[in-house]
Amino acid sequence: TGADTEAVVCVGTACYTAHSGKLSAAEAQNHCNQNGGNLATVKSKEEAQHVQRVLAQLLRREAALTARMSKFWIGLQREKGKCLDPSLPLKGFSWVGGGEDTPYSNWHKELRNSCISKRCVSLLLDLSQPLLPSRLPKWSEGPCGSPGSPGSNIEGFVCKFSFKGMCRPLALGGPGQVTYTTPFQTTSSSLEAVPFASAANVACGEGDKDETQSHYFLCKEKAPDVFDWGSSGPLCVSPKYGCNFNNGGCHQDCFEGGDGSFLCGCRPGFRLLDDLVTCASRNPCSSSPCRGGATCVLGPHGKNYTCRCPQGYQLDSSQLDCVDVDECQDSPCAQECVNTPGGFRCECWVGYEPGGPGEGACQDVDECALGRSPCAQGCTNTDGSFHCSCEEGYVLAGEDGTQCQDVDECVGPGGPLCDSLCFNTQGSFHCGCLPGWVLAPNGVSCT
């Protein structure tokens, strides 16, 4: 069968729809896709609760599902040839709509490694037990099914549709019926939030009799991130009921005139919006929109706000939270820059020390200065370093090349320096002769 009964839950900037029908994962994804969505993501506990709510709504409408343990496709899949990764929360699976891996998961049991076929995930519902927020549906992975053969216990699927914003449901100040038609082709009379680009048909009156007015509205963006119907004042108002019907459709206060007319009003600290129904806080900072260390600063007339960060921090892309400024990006130091929370510090390379003109400057350390020389004999300072030297008859020695070691000229690389005997001395040598021989004037030969 195709996808039949559906249920809808809209929250935040997304709507979730649940459908019954024995479809393969590919067919289910195609169904969601045709209306501009994808099989649902379950990226957090909160999202799992939204999905559970829409499934509960579906189950209340569905008379009887065939299996006690029913499965509903979600948008988590692993392509053929991609192996299981037990170290990841999603175990190597990924969301069909794309997007990053998320830390939340709720696997039913340990997954078996199999890379030979595509695998798909469904939510496992035990219909013998009530759906409780504390008992969220588990994730079950298995074959993705094929047309006409969806897989065992597959009873339906959940789609997700994302929107740039939502409108509040229309408020009726008298008898009438609102029917919302969403961009994903669902009609409903009861939505907690109505997605952008939805249409609302309002039929005023009680049933067939005295149905006098009808209205048509679209949920549209009236100003940046302000989503509204553009209706002015409560709808379907009736002098017969005044404020007694649904509080006159008013968000907060309803005031009746003597002639049966009425007006909406707001409590102290709130102001009436252009729709003449809804109240909004006079102080947008009262809802603490700024996060982290950001301070909320009211704009003129208290209409909007901006978040401000302490020194060394800047607003992130959301403009609500503070992130550390990486001052090192601007290369403020002559040599090394170390970024720190709210600031930075300059460091000098080995052989240099802080100093010299300008902030963060470094100057050469004179390692050969009096009382500082690391060399046993000669020391020559260089930029950022130094080098040691030795007097004649000595060579540099030691691991760090700072020591001087006597050269044993008697075992020099050029062979014996003396014709006969050779005596090594500190920094030098001298030749000698065997008894009966005399050292020649050249100090090397024996005669």
Partner: antibody
Framework: QVQLVQSGPEVKKPGESLKISCKAS????????LNWVRQMPGKGLEWMGR????????DYNGKFKGQVTISADKSSGTAYLQLSSLKASDTAVYFC???????????WGQGTLVTVSS | DIVMTQTPLSLPVTPGEPASISCRFS???????????LYWYLQKPGQSPQLLIY???NLASGVPDRFSGSGSGTDFTLKISRVEAEDVGVYYC?????????FGGGTKLEIK
């Protein structure tokens, strides 16, 4: 391509009324705000109001409320600006302008010059 | 209403030289969504205005990259790196954060 074609220049007497048209083509007329902007001779730009043709929702600049009416006909893709009880100070060029998804006024009509003179 | 002050009123520039126009608003145009709803338009002599920059710094389609927009929540600048003869006209800044939408008074750029 997107085009906004406005009706021709008008010469009116004080106290009369006038309806300027703006024919849109090349985009989904019902799904974008259509604004009206006034430019008095040698002066700057003033936003008068707008309409969302999809459901006829309108917003007006308080300065022009009561003096102008904005309407639209979805079937023909045409927006209208009606000016009532014309005065000499209503002499201006009136532009119709599409508002895009970033709230920019991205496509402008060629303008309609209205001259009010006795 | 959001009020804006645009400076200078008139700007004579030599071709090939840079130019800069400023716009200051009575309140921040930075929305909590991180977008700044500030726009720049150019009205060439005898023509309808045309969009140059949207949301503070984004170049509209077909606009040469010698134009650039920058600024903070209330202070904004339109820069032309090298002015060309075809750039003459009146430049307007505008805000679309809050109804009624409002325009700056305009800056007339002319060639020296």
């Amino acid at each position: 391509q997107v085009q906004l074609v406005q009706s021709g220049p008008e010469v009116k007497k004080p106290g009369e009324s006038l309806k300027i048209s703006c024919k849109a083509s090349g985009y989904a007329f019902s799904s974008y705000w259509l604004n009206w902007v006034r430019q008095m001779p040698g002066k700057g730009l003033e936003w008068m109001g707008r309409i969302y043709p999809g459901d006829g929702d309108t917003d007006y600049n308080g300065k022009f409320k009561g003096q102008v009416t904005i309407s639209a006909d979805k079937s023909s893709g045409t927006a209208y600006l009606q000016l009532s009880s014309l005065k000499a100070s209503d002499t201006a060029v009136y532009f119709c302008v599409r508002g895009d998804g970033y709230w920019a006024m991205d496509y402008w009509g060629q303008g309609t010059l209205v001259t009010v003179s006795s | 209403d959001i009020v804006m002050t645009q400076t200078p009123l008139s700007l004579p520039v030599t071709p090939g030289e840079p130019a800069s126009i400023s716009c200051r608003f009575s309140q921040s145009l930075l929305h909590s969504n991180g977008i700044t709803y500030l726009y720049w338009y150019l009205q060439k002599p005898g023509q309808s205005p045309q969009l140059l920059i949207y949301t503070m710094s984004n170049l509209a389609s077909g606009v040469p990259d010698r134009f650039s927009g920058s600024g903070s929540g209330t202070d904004f600048t339109l820069k032309i790196s090298r002015v060309e003869a075809e750039d003459v006209g009146v430049y307007y800044c505008a805000q679309n954060l809050e109804l009624p939408w409002t325009f700056g008074g305009g800056t007339k750029l002319e060639i020296k």
